[in-house]
Interface confidence: medium
């Protein structure tokens, strides 16, 4: 029969190096009689026999960590005791070695030029990995603006446009190398106007192109504002080249305006804008038409269809690029202005405006427009539309309405030929002749001008029955 023998550890534990997810084994060979009980500790804490992360075999002499984790490093001890003599212990360290691992990779960053950008790159590994950065295909060199921090993050002070590009961090130790995914650093630049629109002074009905050029990252959008509101008409052509946007607003000018080019780009939730403005003013419309060049043709438009004589030839002024279109738009604009006037004034004003804008025409060798007869013009101004005319002139005097006076193609009555001098030299307004049949009295009108300014319409043509100051019979 064997004699009792106190435990002796014949192979002391050694330091074990293990890679994460690999197997690590400690061997604790014990000689004793009777057979000892062997227990294991990690960092002085007992390892439980039923812990499935471990395998204890050979009567407790072999401890295997089945899949090493980085948290498994520490001091492992085996303790052997068989009741004979004292317990014996041997200890050894587990050093968990780890290939580099990037635990917080960099992410895509958008940053405004001039600010500071930080691209994170937090790593794990044993030995501790060194971190470097690649931009595009080349290793990134540190300088006064660009530094790799102790944490591995890349810091760029005062970001410049040329810093934009694709970056990745590289973590390296003796066991291997880890690369992050490529991330994009986008450098955003506030919108800036390179070329402001220019102001213009043009004739009514002409085309004007306002040009505005802006730069920024992302490429700005350009919008146009007319007198504080979005531009309602006109065509916009845009082109983009090398982050520069070129916007051209083509306008058909029917009224003066302040046109503002607004360049906007978005930075996250915020916007940056740049503005530049130009004025478009209208050169005076009612120039003498004696020197007008043009042609005689039938009226094909809509607005004056019911007013003009059906088969009459009217004068189209070729000082406009497209006379028919320009004159039609002008009358359309005037028509809208007339929506607010009284029922007495409106048809008379429509007749006046249509016949003034689309003057009767004698073809001849030189097409000649025939102006409205002065008497008819004055009848509209001083009789049918007296209140409206006064209000308009009052506003004009106060400078409130300057553009409106020029916009409405109203003739200057005093400059028109009188039908008393030469009845064939001017155009009558059939509408006013017709009214004599239907109107017996007009309301009393206080005129801003003496009645002598209004020559009588001849009885043969018209016999208005009006207040005494305007007796035209």
């Amino acid at each position: 029969e064997k004699l009792p023998k106190a435990p002796v550890i014949t192979t002391p534990l050694e330091t074990v190096d293990a890679l994460v997810e690999e197997v690590a084994t400690f061997m604790c060979a014990v000689e004793s009689y009777p057979q000892p009980e062997i227990s294991w500790t990690r960092n002085k804490i007992l390892i439980k026999l039923f812990d499935t992360r471990y395998s204890i075999r050979e009567n407790g002499q072999l401890l295997t960590i089945l899949s090493v984790e980085d948290s498994d490093d520490g001091i492992y001890c085996c303790i052997a005791n068989n009741g004979v003599g004292g317990a014996v212990e041997s200890c050894g360290a587990l050093q968990v070695k780890m290939k580099p691992k990037i635990t917080r990779p960099p992410i895509n960053v958008k940053i405004i030029e001039g600010l500071k950008a930080v691209l994170p790159c937090t790593t794990m590994g044993n030995p501790k990995p060194s971190v470097s950065w690649i931009k595009g295909d080349n290793a990134l060199r540190e300088n006064s603006r660009i530094a790799v921090l102790e944490s591995g993050s890349l810091r760029i002070h005062n970001v410049q446009k040329e810093d934009a590009g694709q970056y990745r961090c590289v973590a390296k130790n003796s066991l291997g190398t880890a690369y992050s995914k490529l991330v994009k650093l986008e450098v955003e630049v506030f919108a800036r106007i390179l070329r402001a629109p220019e102001s213009h002074n043009v004739t009514f009905g002409s085309f004007v192109t306002l040009r505005c050029t802006a730069i920024g990252i992302p490429v700005p959008t350009i919008s146009w504002i007319e007198n504080g509101n979005a531009v309602s008409s006109g065509s916009i052509q845009e082109s983009v080249k090398d982050r520069v946007i070129d916007s051209r607003l083509q306008l058909f000018i029917t009224k003066p305006g302040l046109y503002t080019c607004i360049a906007t780009n978005k930075h996250g939730e915020k916007f940056s804008t740049a503005k530049a403005a130009a004025t478009v003013s209208i050169a005076e419309w009612s120039k003498s038409q004696k020197d007008s060049q043009g042609y005689c043709a039938q009226y094909r438009g809509e607005v004056c269809d019911a007013v003009l004589a059906k088969d009459a030839l009217v004068f189209f002024n070729t000082s406009y690029r497209d006379p028919e279109d320009a004159q039609e738009l002008l009358i359309h604009t005037a028509w809208n202005e007339l929506k607010a006037v009284s029922p007495l004034c409106r048809p008379a004003a429509e007749a006046l405006l249509c016949n003034h804008l689309f003057q009767e025409c004698s073809p001849g060798v030189v097409p000649t427009p025939m102006p409205i007869c002065r008497e008819y013009c004055l009848a509209v101004k001083e009789l049918f539309c007296a209140k409206e005319w006064q209000a308009m002139e009052g506003k004009a005097h106060r400078g409130l309405y300057r553009s409106g006076m020029h916009l409405l193609p109203v003739p200057e009555c005093s400059k028109l030929p009188s039908m008393h001098r030469d009845p064939t030299a001017c155009t009558r307004l059939p509408y006013l002749d017709y009214k004599k049949e239907n109107i017996t009295t007009f309301p009393s009108i206080t005129s801003s001008r003496p009645s002598a300014d209004i020559p009588n319409l001849p009885a043969s043509t018209s016999s208005f029955a009006v207040s005494p100051a305007y007796s035209m019979t």
């Epitope: 043709a297 039938q298 094909r300 809509e302 059906k310 028919e324 039609e328 738009l329």
Partner: antibody
């Protein structure tokens, strides 16, 4: 680039209805008069209808008056032709055409590729 | 009813000059009819050549010109080329009781 794209054509029985649409792009639609022109197989061009820029007036060929209705939606850049009480003689390729200016009777300066309307029992 | 008349067919030698005309069955064509000219090749949509008597549409070669000759509108092609072989239509604005736009029957031009 001015583009006019007609749709809505097809086969319809006599007395039936069709609505043609014309989607316009590449120009400020609301600044131009528009027209429909048709061409019967192997025949010449025939003006059908016209509408000015604002759509206030409409004009029709005598033979389609009361049956066809031209309209426009400037907010959608679209021209329409509602055709009712269709007859065999309305069979044709229908072209949408842009006028050169605001008025309804300016020159036709841009044309779509056409949509075929066949009226047959 | 307004009827617009055109020569049904016409032929021209390459490099030659041809004048196609457009008349009204009743009366003369004047600038008030705003004559327009269109070219159409088989299977294609028409193409605008001349508008309002003599204005050339953008992109149209200056070989094409429009005018009023006597009591008719005219389209003249100088230095005719093979690809000028097409149908040519004139369009007239007319006002006879109501506004109207009328096409001629078209002229088939052959470049021999």
């Amino acid at each position: 680039e001015v583009q006019l794209l007609e749709s809505g054509g097809g086969l319809v029985q006599p007395g039936g209805s069709l609505r043609l649409s014309c989607a316009a792009s590449g120009f400020t639609f609301s600044d131009y008069g528009m027209s429909w022109v048709r061409q019967a197989p192997g025949k010449g061009l025939e003006w059908v209808s016209a509408i000015p820029w604002q759509g206030g007036s409409t004009y029709y060929k005598e033979s389609v008056k009361g049956r066809f209705t031209i309209s426009r939606d400037n907010s959608k850049n679209t021209l329409y032709l509602q055709m009712n009480s269709l007859r065999a003689e309305d069979t044709a390729v229908y072209y949408c055409a842009k006028r050169s200016g605001r008025i309804a009777f300016g020159a036709l300066d841009a044309w779509g590729q056409g949509t075929l309307v066949t009226v047959s029992s | 009813q307004t009827v617009v008349t055109q020569e049904p067919s016409f032929s021209v030698s390459p490099g030659g000059t041809v004048t196609l005309t457009c008349g009204l069955s009743s009366g003369s064509v004047t600038s008030s009819n705003y004559p327009d000219w269109y070219q159409q090749t088989p299977g294609q949509a028409p193409r605008t050549l001349i508008y309002s008597t003599d204005s050339r549409h953008s992109g149209v070669p200056d070989r094409f010109s429009g005018s009023i000759l006597g009591n008719k509108a005219a389209l003249t092609i100088t230095g005719a080329q093979a690809d000028d072989e097409s149908d040519y239509y004139c369009g007239l604005y007319s006002y006879s009781g109501s506004k109207n736009y009328v096409f001629g029957g078209g002229t088939k031009l052959t470049v021999l």
